[in-house]
């Protein structure tokens, strides 16, 4: 439960989050596991340890092996594991599965790749973007943040997308490559006014306080590709981002289904241990394509039931 | 050593609210969470909610949710709990306790509430 | 809801004895279990976290073990001392405290 894998490639910077999470203010040790030494946090270590984070700077094959990291509150105690592998640069193009993160799937009209992992970083824009290792040229492709755009996606898009940006420590630059699998889903079609399936205008969703919740905003647009579909969550008519509550956050990027040769979008809005002030908001769903935007309204209630003791 | 002092015994009457103050010494109150935990007389430790007093996030325990204010002076390092609509069974000993997300370590030593008409 | 079954409520044992209180839950939770004893008239006192840390001062005899739905607080040689009521608390989904166990001298 407190165990994560986290890998990288020799010579390139790699940062591990601790997978027990506390205050900022916590302090958090970290030790080989194998030999319990203490990972130092004077930054003109290799390694070294900033808090929360465990950083290779750059990344050594023999760094491979599994790190404690303990989290210190005044009163506790609390242990988590990196389990940390670090490959050779393959001589080839080929990306081994073990070196590939989640595989994402894009529609033919546009479609976002985030680039795995990079919030944990320093990094600045641009982007670099490689697809098969070959560097991604043309207007077709738009380094956007922390994601690449691909506009009018065929099928022949697919494939293993690399990014690659610097890492900054101290004035010192490190580079970090992420790859994952792109998927295109073939399909000629038309576009309407969205559609949405979920959740119906006005709807009202029972919670349990102190609870996870979760609302899905799902939409479809036309069939086949669509140029441009997006959904997204507003609470009381602001964007999440301006929404200064990190308890409720919206899905990064958006699923794409095909329902009945219809294409739909959807994103999740996870509202993590509801509290009661989440029942005064207004949550929006919104559904934008080139024939306009659709708006459903959901709200939250307190769950009733009986208590026995 | 860390101690937790809270306020005196109270009495109030059915629909009245009460305020406890827990004061903590030897420790900084932003450096972890206060926990809440009621005990009802002869009856089991039941928890209340917990609040982060470096930002105020505060969570509560369904049963006690509408009703249970948690509140934290980083000032004086002083917590509070202030249960309203106060009924019969309400009636018990009320802790505070510091500890992190997970658990309480160091608790106060009680403060009874009694409610009658 | 996560719901802890604690057992036994009430324990007769003697001086020396070695006792075994279990606390099951409803769903996995790991090792995010704890135990606490309190005496009459007193706070409750931490003994174990996340199922078999031991908190500093804590005599050896106590011991806790056990994962996923199952844990346990064994004592080896019962004490004068710990004739007491012991609760395991949960913190994997908020908190919530077993119904106590009792434990009374023989």
């Known amino acids: 439960k407190f165990s994560k894998q986290s890998w990288g490639l020799e010579n390139e910077a790699l940062i591990v989050r601790c997978p027990r999470q506390g205050k900022s203010s916590y302090i958090v040790d970290w030790y080989y596991s194998q030999t319990n030494k203490s990972i130092p946090t004077q930054e003109r270590n290799r390694v070294f340890a900033s808090g929360q984070l465990l950083k290779f700077l750059p990344a050594e094959v023999a760094d491979s092996g599994i790190y404690t990291c303990i989290v210190r509150s005044p009163t506790f105690n609390r242990t988590g594991y990196a389990n940390v592998t670090i490959y050779k640069k393959q001589p080839d193009c080929n990306v081994p599965d073990y070196l590939m993160y989640s595989t994402v799937s894009g529609s033919e009209k546009n479609s976002k790749i985030y680039c795995p992992t990079i919030d944990l970083y320093n990094w600045t824009a641009p982007l670099e973007w490689f697809k098969n290792c070959q560097a991604l040229q043309g207007s077709r492709y738009k380094a956007h943040k922390s994601f690449l755009v691909i506009d009018n996606v065929m099928t022949d898009d697919a494939g293993d997308y690399t990014c690659k940006f610097i890492h900054n420590e101290n004035g010192a630059n490190y580079s970090v490559t992420a790859t994952r699998s792109f998927t295109v889903k073939d399909e000629q079609g038309f576009s309407l006014f969205p559609v949405i399936r979920a959740p119906a205008h006005n709807e009202t969703k029972e919670v349990e306080i102190g609870e996870n919740t979760n609302l899905t905003c799902s939409a479809c647009f036309g069939k086949g590709a669509q140029f441009l579909a997006t959904v997204q969550w507003q609470l009381n008519g602001n964007k999440i981002t301006d929404f200064s509550e990190p308890r409720i956050q919206q899905e990064e990027g958006q699923n794409q289904s095909f329902s009945n040769g219809l294409a739909c979008v959807n994103t999740v809005l996870r509202i993590a241990d509801v509290k009661e002030e989440d029942l005064l908001l207004r949550y929006d769903c919104l559904a934008l394509n080139l024939h306009g935007l659709r708006r459903h309204t959901i709200r939250l209630s307190r769950k009733h039931h009986h208590h026995h003791h | 050593e860390v101690q937790l002092v809270q306020s005196g015994a109270e009495v109030k009457k059915p629909g009245a609210t009460v305020k406890i103050s827990c004061k903590v010494s030897?420790?900084?109150?932003?450096?972890?969470?206060m926990h809440w935990v009621q005990q009802a007389p002869g009856k089991g430790l039941e928890w209340m909610g917990r609040?982060?007093?470096?930002?105020?996030?505060?969570e509560y325990a369904e049963k006690f949710q509408g009703r249970v204010t948690i509140t934290a002076d980083t000032s004086t390092d002083t917590a509070y709990m202030e249960l309203s609509s106060l009924r019969s069974e309400d009636t018990a000993v009320y802790y505070c306790?510091?500890?992190?997300?997970?658990?309480?370590?160091?608790w106060g030593q009680g403060t009874l509430v009694t409610v009658s008409s | 809801d996560i719901q802890l079954t604690q057992s036994p409520s009430f324990l007769s044992a003697s001086v020396g004895d070695r006792v075994t209180i279990t606390c099951i839950t409803n769903?996995?939770?790991?090792?995010?279990i704890h135990w606490y004893q309190q005496k009459p008239g007193k706070a409750p006192k931490l003994l174990i976290y996340?199922?078999?840390t031991l908190r500093p001062g804590v005599p050896s005899r106590f011991s806790g073990s056990g994962s996923g739905t199952e844990f346990t607080l064994t004592i080896s040689s019962l004490q004068p001392e710990d004739f007491a009521t012991y609760y395991c608390?949960?913190?994997?989904?908020?908190?919530?405290f077993g119904q106590g166990t009792k434990l009374e001298i023989k």
């Open positions: 306790a510091t500890g992190d997300f997970y658990a309480m370590a160091y």
């Open positions: 030897a420790f900084n109150i932003k450096d972890d969470y």
């Open positions: 609040i982060d007093p470096a930002i105020g996030n505060t």
């Open positions: 769903t996995d939770i790991d090792d995010v």
């Open positions: 996340e199922g078999n």
């Open positions: 608390l949960q913190s994997d989904n908020m908190l919530t």
